[in-house]
Interface confidence: low
């Protein structure tokens, strides 16, 4: 039997609105929460496309809005149909597309053939799809200033580019309980947005924005040394596309040091953590002298996922120690700061031989005093596999 | 912060024209549609219409298409409503707001027009 | 175009009361949004979406409502609360507004 309804099923999943004039919007529409093609065409009425008409519609493959009065796709108007690969909204009073309303989907295709669209940098995006052959765009029609059936492109007088964006940073080192002043400046053309990302800033310092287009200001009262390693970005929008540039403020601190007990891996482990902005310098003394790095006594850092702190993790490790490594190990740290030590007693094995003198020590010691010719413990960072 | 300035009253004559503004600032003007609306005395509130300043994209309630005109001046932020062919009917507080992805988000104080002769 | 009917016209409630009033759209809209005016000073967007405040709203108001029937209430009626609220489809050219419920304080 024929459908007289405004909009028809097709098939199992499909719906047709073709009864001219009879939509306004799409909000509502009965039974589309399985929708995955919606099909309208004729609607003189329907103007304005907004995220709100196409919220439930989460499973939406193919819209196509044709041969309508449509005038006004908004930003975020795709919010909810993230799975959207085929849009048509040729023959429609489209002069304009913002690059944000396809953000973040995986067009195969894109139709706007039609459409009185308005050749400017809002659209450049656009022309760069059509150049780069990009998922199947037609346009046909981009008018500059008068109508035309050809792709024409922007003059070459006309410069359409994203924002550029800079963030100022103080010149002076920052130290724990400052305050630290940003800056940034925008520069572009049509700039419509712009704002800080501070998300990782959370307990690290009391955020204070002030400004607006182009130069947008931040204070960061109190900063604490967990600022060390967070990214501070600032974004621009325009007609053409978005732009962002992130710093990270270092602050200054102390060095500090913990040591854990002997553990028994592949080699054994004395394990530490260091922390202190700048990086401090390590040294290990052995019974009250330096100790000088061997291939089988080394320094390991271990590799750590979080690139978001100063902390650094390692190991002191050594190769099938005997009872000749056994002793107190200290861990010296320092930086421009301030310097921290900390010692752990690490017993390998017993002595085998109790009553005889004590077999040559395998690991060079001297004395710590200004005359001591060893040289400094090598750090050997990440590129020492573990183990 | 964002501001939309409006003189407090107009007086025209029946028959004339009266070009209403409302100055924007702490925003970015061409961003945001602006809309115009009217509200007689002890009445409610009737939308007119609605423009967008980065391209001058105008919308109209049928009711006002013929006698309402809205433009806008970039360089000043500045939005213009012109409504011609005053009767007493006009007499109202006429309202500018600023939209951009939710409704009309700051009003102006609005200005005062009585039609009188 | 869409009429909004908002009901009661004018209803006065007593401090610590709850107020509930509505507003019936004569088509299905997405969202309802409510603005409230008090004498002689310009509207204030006061929910949006139907159900989200605006800044600086206190949170005894709330909103709710979906297809053509929505709601405005106010958990705890508080003086300053006396104004009228008018209620605003943003779904359709014309855009429209209910003609508004004046609520008073007893």
């Known amino acids: 039997a024929s459908c007289r309804e405004v909009c028809c099923p097709v098939g199992p999943s499909g719906l047709r609105c073709t009864r001219a004039g009879s939509l306004d919007t799409l909000r509502g529409l009965r039974g589309a929460g399985n929708l995955t093609e919606l099909y309208v065409e004729n609607q003189q009425h329907l103007q304005r496309l907004e995220f709100e008409d196409l919220q439930g519609l989460g499973e939406l493959r193919s819209l196509t809005i044709v041969k309508s009065g449509l005038r006004f796709v908004a930003p975020d108007a795709f919010r909810f149909t993230p799975r959207l690969s085929h849009l048509n909204l040729s023959s429609n009073a489209l002069e304009s597309l913002s690059w944000k309303t396809v953000q973040g989907l995986s067009l195969q295709d894109l139709t706007l053939s039609g459409n009185p669209l308005h050749c400017s940098c809002a659209l450049f995006w656009l022309q760069r799809w059509e150049q780069e052959g990009l998922c199947g765009v037609h346009t046909q029609t981009l008018h500059d200033s008068g109508p035309g059936d050809q792709f024409l492109p922007l003059g070459h007088n006309t410069s359409c580019g994203v924002p550029t964006v800079k963030i100022q940073m103080p010149n002076d080192s920052v130290e724990v309980g400052d305050d630290v002043f940003l800056q940034c400046q925008v520069e572009g053309l049509a700039l419509q947005q712009a704002d800080w990302i501070l998300t990782e800033l959370e307990g690290a310092a009391t955020v204070k924005k002030f400004g607006d287009l182009p130069s947008l200001g931040l204070i960061l009262v109190n900063v604490t040394s967990d600022l060390n390693k967070k990214n501070v970005t600032c974004w621009a929008e325009n007609d053409v596309g978005r732009a962002e540039v992130s710093v990270q403020v270092s602050v200054s601190f102390p060095a500090s040091v913990h040591l854990g007990l002997a553990v028994e891996q592949h080699h054994w482990c004395i394990p530490f953590s260091v922390d202190g902005q700048p990086a401090p310098s390590l040294r290990w003394l052995f019974n009250g002298s330096v100790l000088n790095e061997t291939s089988f006594i080394f320094t390991q850092f271990l590799e750590s996922a979080l690139t978001n702190e100063t902390m650094r993790h390692g190991c002191l490790r050594l190769n099938q120690p005997t009872h000749v490594n056994n002793g107190n190990y200290t861990l010296l740290a320092a930086n421009p700061y301030g310097q921290a030590a900390a010692s752990v007693m690490a017993a390998f094995m017993d002595n085998p031989f109790e009553f005889n003198p004590e077999d040559p020590i395998p690991v060079s010691f001297s004395p710590v005093d200004g005359n001591s010719t060893s040289r400094d413990p090598v750090e050997k960072k990440d590129e020492t596999p573990f183990g | 912060q964002v501001q939309l300035q409006q003189p407090g009253a107009e007086l025209v004559k029946p028959g004339a024209s009266v070009k209403l503004s409302c100055k924007s600032s702490g925003y970015t003007f061409t961003n945001y549609w602006m809309h115009w609306v009217k509200q007689r005395p002890g009445q409610g509130l009737e939308w007119i219409g609605e423009i967008y300043p980065s391209n001058g994209r105008t919308n109209y309630n049928e009711k006002f298409k013929n006698r309402a005109t809205l433009t806008v001046d970039i360089s000043s932020s500045t939005a213009y409503m012109q409504l011609s062919s005053l009767t007493s009917e006009d007499s109202a507080v006429y309202y500018c707001?600023?939209?951009?992805?939710?409704?009309?988000?700051?009003w102006g104080q609005g200005t005062s027009v009585t039609v009188s002769s | 175009q869409i009429v909004l009917t908002q009901s009661p016209a004018i209803m006065s409630a007593s401090p610590g009361e709850k107020v509930t009033m509505t507003c019936s759209a004569s088509?299905?809209?997405?969202?309802m949004h409510w603005y409230q005016q008090k004498s002689g000073t310009s509207p204030k967007r006061w929910i949006y979406?139907?159900?989200k405040l605006a800044s600086g709203v206190p949170t005894r108001f709330s909103g709710s409502g979906s297809g053509t029937s929505y709601s405005l209430t106010i958990s705890s009626m508080e003086a300053e609360d006396a104004a009228t609220y008018y209620c605003?489809?943003?779904?359709?050219?014309?855009?429209?507004f209910g003609s508004g419920t004046k609520l008073e304080i007893k």
């Open positions: 088509s299905s809209v997405g969202y």
């Open positions: 979406d139907t159900s």
């Open positions: 707001a600023r939209s951009r992805y939710d409704p009309m988000e700051d």
């Open positions: 605003q489809q943003w779904s359709s050219i014309p855009l429209t």
